[in-house]
């Protein structure tokens, strides 16, 4: 018989309801807003804000100020109050929509609902290792802004993404803003729009470069400004928007704005569409060519990326590459395919694709048909002329309008669909070692750790835990502070390491072993921790094997047995090859002497799969009793694999040495012919992996065996007449004298 | 008007090396990406090397991988592929092209580079 | 690597006639990163089509693209006496980026 050891699922080295408990701030109401702060001279600080109120923390997650930033009108608004005796405009909660840094000075600012959508600067106070705020600043000069004017009306109650960008000595805040038409006739915000600080911090520069939706599109086009990021020569934006001026407004799409980050003008503002796609590699009859489009964007993210992404994206080492989260629709609900899905989009191609559309449109030969796009900002027009216009004036440049470059930038989920059911809710990047790993939060307010890797069927977890109780979704946006990740999920902000919250969810020594070195996971006896969790005898070296099971449970006391071991940690190598003295077996006090590999045996093993097999030929000592033993394996002396070394003893218990009896032949002639069927009865005759019948020295072929019977065919007599009959059984004669006489047919 | 112009082409050992020059006028330069693509005599089309318009981005043919470099000078106009340990399958007719998302839409006229003892 | 098949190797026909030529890919070539080129003895390989169904600047209306996934076609609707060349189609989509083996249209 042909025995094999049972799979383990891979998912059974760990366990994802192991309870961490990481570092967190309750802020008394939904987290709105959260940014960090990190200085050169060791000082830092996360910035919280919720209804009303801005919260000031520590790095360790404590409180160390908080300010009144609402209601308007009411006496106690700190931020109200610094500009100067109001009343301002209606009275009413300030909801946080903005809150940046500006690098530049270093300074914190805020913008919220109230107060046609003002903002406040918060100069930063290092003091010691924690900073404070000095008094705000309001940025907001009565006298310049009128409600058809407004440089200082910032924030729009629906939603507003904010980069600021240091040029020379200035500040440039780079701004969208969804709108409707509501909103637009409240002090004008716009849709888009450059605005330099003032150097005496009294608002913004008037005069600002900006785009709107046009007033005959506002009730219809509505856009959701996603993300903003600031890398290299360019600010970026990614919106959610409706595919199409003229059809139906739910049919949605992504799409990313670039703005040049050298030059506060708008005239080589540029839009693309981002196509996300679940391609799975076998595609259902009906399934869309091309994959399954997931249009909508829900979160995103830029980082440079590791070595080991890098080449699988075809790119350098350290490049920058957007990473997004997306859905199939607003509701992200479920469909065929994955909940979310994660693209990639190298801005060196994104960059690439824009810069020839923009040729395309403008070099000549004319690309007859090509429209210039952005109807919603501006008027139709075809490509190179400028909007709305027939034809370039000799002084103007096609290349100094804003364009929609006609083609899309198309990618397909990097993990191939396996986020299934996971609805992503919030997204952050990093580069640890060569590893790039998405730390993502959910909607049911768990956080997994993943590396970002193509072309597995099966997720690389570093972690995947819950932030607390409540189950509540994590918010949007994530920041960092050092080696830590800001985390927002109802009224709590949550500190989760880079390197993951810990190693307790590795459950066996080798899954611990082979996890990423930056996690600082170690063998701690029987459980996987970081150093300081178990000091004594906490090592990174060396697992035991693992004995999980063997075959069979028993075995003659005379003869011997051929005993296959499962586990893991046997070999470290897929080859299953042993140096010769490094794996000792013993069952009880027997030993058990190791059979070289079959090679033609060996069997894949996919990597969603683990097992290990090891066989072992027993032959009892004299000495050994019958009855119940333990099988133990002991490996020592093993060259190291690529993560540790094999060394020490797994003992299990339940193997039993018995002695198989013969009690009862028949019948005891049959025709010389063969053929007939003998049954043997006794005692423990199926124990072991070998038993034969010999008639006469030849092999009496086995029909069925159980513990108390043994059936099987006579082979052919030479003459008539009576013959030894006896049984073997791991090789060793079974006791008895027993004759079978042939007849003649 | 467009115009790809290479260079740099000729006789070689094999084990030897080459640098071919591409040289662009007629249009911006530094927002295109670029390739070079070869054809052996009576054989098909053979793609070689991509780079993209601000260099960070660089692909290769399997055939060629570890032995050519494809680079570019936006401030001179030009796009350049080095090759190194030269073998007889390499001889052929190098064409440098323009473009990408939008196909390779205007194409040199070649150097021949032949590599033989 | 994606392989590009093109068929029928060599298209004996008449001018006036149609021309269809077949690019057939050894895995999906999503979002239609495919173009066709024309090559004539002696001279640069010339874009005809991307993006499977975008005719390229300049190129006349009888050369049309089609087709999407792992099966593509180039349409020339009336053969002119210039149109006899090799055609390829090529993939720009994974990495490497390949041809097809060509197909040789000669005036039967």
């Known amino acids: 018989e042909d025995w094999q050891c049972p799979r383990t699922p891979y998912a059974a080295s760990r366990d994802f309801d192991v309870k961490y408990v990481v570092p967190s701030f309750s802020a008394g109401g939904l987290v709105q807003a959260m940014v960090t702060y990190e200085g050169d001279r060791n000082e830092s600080a996360v910035f919280v804000a919720i209804r009303n109120r801005l919260h000031v923390l520590g790095p360790d997650l404590k409180s160390v100020q908080s300010l009144a930033t609402g209601p308007a009108g009411d006496p106690g608004c700190q931020t109200c109050a610094a500009c100067g005796p109001g009343p301002h405009g209606p009275p009413g909660d300030t909801d946080t929509k903005v809150l940046v840094l500006d690098p530049a000075l270093p300074a914190l600012v805020s913008c919220g609902s109230s107060l046609q959508g003002r903002c406040f600067l918060h100069d930063l106070e290092p003091q010691g290792t924690a900073v404070h705020l000095a008094a705000p600043a309001c940025l907001f000069s009565a006298h310049h802004n009128r409600p058809d004017d407004c440089p200082d009306c910032v924030a729009s109650p629906l939603g507003t993404r904010v980069t600021v960008v240091e040029q020379g000595q200035a500040s440039y805040f780079y701004v969208a803003s969804s709108l409707d038409a509501a909103v637009a006739a409240s002090f004008s915000p716009r849709s888009v729009s450059i605005r330099r600080l003032k150097a005496d911090a009294s608002g913004f520069a008037p005069g600002f470069v900006a785009l709107s939706v046009l007033p005959k599109h506002l009730v219809s086009y509505s856009i959701e400004y996603v993300h903003s990021f600031h890398t290299g020569a360019f600010v970026y934006f990614l919106t959610v928007q409706p595919a199409s001026v003229t059809d139906d407004p739910s049919a949605l799409h992504t799409r990313l704005a670039r703005l040049s980050a050298t030059e506060p003008e708008l005239g080589d503002y540029r839009e693309l569409v981002l196509d996300c796609r679940f391609a799975p590699k076998r595609r259902r009859r009906g399934a869309p060519e091309g994959g399954q489009p997931y249009p909508v964007l829900r979160v995103a993210h830029s980082a440079p990326v590791g070595a080991q992404l890098a080449t699988e994206l075809s790119i350098a080492e350290g490049q920058e590459v957007l990473f997004g989260v997306f859905v199939t629709g607003k509701d992200g609900g479920p469909g065929v395919g994955p909940n979310s899905v994660v693209c990639a989009f190298p801005i060196d191609l994104l960059d690439t694709l824009i810069d020839e559309g923009v040729e395309r449109c403008c070099e000549s030969p004319v690309h007859p048909g090509l429209r210039r796009g952005l109807d919603f900002f501006q008027s139709p027009s075809f490509c190179p002329n400028p909007p709305g216009l027939e034809a370039l004036s000799p002084n103007t440049s096609c290349r100094h309008f804003p364009l929609l470059v006609s083609s899309s930038f198309s990618r397909v989920d990097l993990f191939n669909g396996l986020l299934g059911p996971v609805q992503v809710t919030a997204l952050y990047v990093t580069r640890l070692d060569n590893v790039t790993v998405a730390h993502m939060g959910t909607m049911d307010g768990r956080i997994l750790q993943v590396e970002l890797v193509r072309s597995l069927n099966y997720l690389l977890y570093v972690s995947n835990f819950s932030l607390g109780d409540s189950g509540q979704p994590v918010q949007r946006d994530v920041s960092r502070l050092g080696d830590h990740l800001l985390f927002a999920s109802g009224d709590q902000v949550f500190q989760v390491p880079i390197q993951g919250p810990g190693c307790r969810h590795f459950l066996t020594c080798g899954r611990c072993l082979r996890a990423w070195h930056f996690m600082g996971c170690g063998w701690c006896g029987n459980m996987c921790g970081q150093q300081k969790e178990c000091p004594g005898s906490w090592q990174q070296d060396h697992c035991p094997p693992k004995l999980t099971e063997f075959h069979p449970h028993s075995g003659p006391l005379r003869g011997s047995t051929r005993l296959t071991l499962c586990g893991s940690n046997f070999y470290l190598h897929p080859s299953g090859l042993v140096p010769e003295g490094t794996h000792q077996v013993t069952v009880g006090q027997s030993p058990c002497r190791p059979l070289p590999k079959d090679s033609s045996k060996l069997r894949p093993v996919p990597r969603k799969d683990f097992v290990e097999e090891f066989e072992c030929e027993l032959e009892p000592l004299g000495t050994q009793a019958v009855g119940p033993t333990n099988v133990s394996l002991t490996v020592t002396n093993m060259p190291p694999g690529k993560h540790f070394r094999v060394d020490g003893t797994s003992v299990l218990r339940g193997f039993s040495f018995m002695e198989p009896v013969l009690i009862a032949v028949q019948p005891l002639f049959g025709p010389r012919a063969g053929g007939t069927c003998l049954t043997l009865e006794g005692q423990s005759l199926s124990v072991g992996t070998s038993r034969a019948v010999l008639v006469n020295g030849t092999e009496c072929l086995l029909a069925r065996v159980s513990e108390g019977q043994l059936l099987c065919a006579t082979p052919p007599g030479a003459t008539v007449a009576s013959v030894p009959l006896s049984l073997q059984v791991g090789g060793a004669q079974v006791p008895g004298s027993w004759t079978f006489q042939y007849r003649e047919d | 008007q467009v115009q790809l112009v290479e260079s740099g082409g000729g006789l070689v050992q094999p084990g030897g090396s080459l640098r071919l020059s591409c040289a662009a006028s007629?249009?911006?330069?530094?927002?295109?990406?670029m390739s070079w693509v070869r054809q052996a005599p009576g054989k098909g089309l053979e793609w070689v090397s991509y780079?993209?318009?601000?260099?960070?981005?660089?692909y290769y043919a399997d055939s060629v991988k570890g032995r050519f470099t494809i680079s570019r000078d936006n401030s001179k106009n030009t796009l350049y592929l080095q090759m190194n340990s030269l073998r007889a399958e390499d001889t052929a007719v190098y064409y440098c092209?323009?473009?990408?998302?939008?196909?390779?839409?205007?194409w040199g006229q070649g150097t021949l580079v032949t590599v033989s003892s | 690597d994606i392989v590009l098949t093109q068929s029928p190797a060599t298209l004996s026909l008449s001018p006036g006639e149609r021309a269809t030529l077949s690019c057939r890919a050894s895995?999906?070539?999503?979002?239609?990163?495919l173009g066709w080129y024309q090559q004539k003895p002696g001279q640069a390989p010339r874009l005809l089509i991307y993006?499977?169904?975008n005719r390229a600047t300049g190129v006349p209306a009888r050369f049309s693209g089609s087709g999407s996934g792992t099966d593509f076609t180039l349409t020339i609707s009336s053969l002119e006496p210039e149109d006899f060349a090799t055609y390829y189609c090529f993939q720009y989509l994974i990495v490497p980026f390949t041809f097809g083996q060509g197909t040789k249209v000669e005036i039967k």
């Open positions: 993006g499977a169904s």
């Open positions: 895995q999906s070539v999503s979002f239609d990163y």
């Open positions: 007629g249009f911006t330069f530094n927002s295109y990406s």
């Open positions: 780079i993209s318009s601000r260099s960070s981005t660089t």
């Open positions: 092209a323009r473009g990408y998302f939008h196909g390779m839409d205007y």
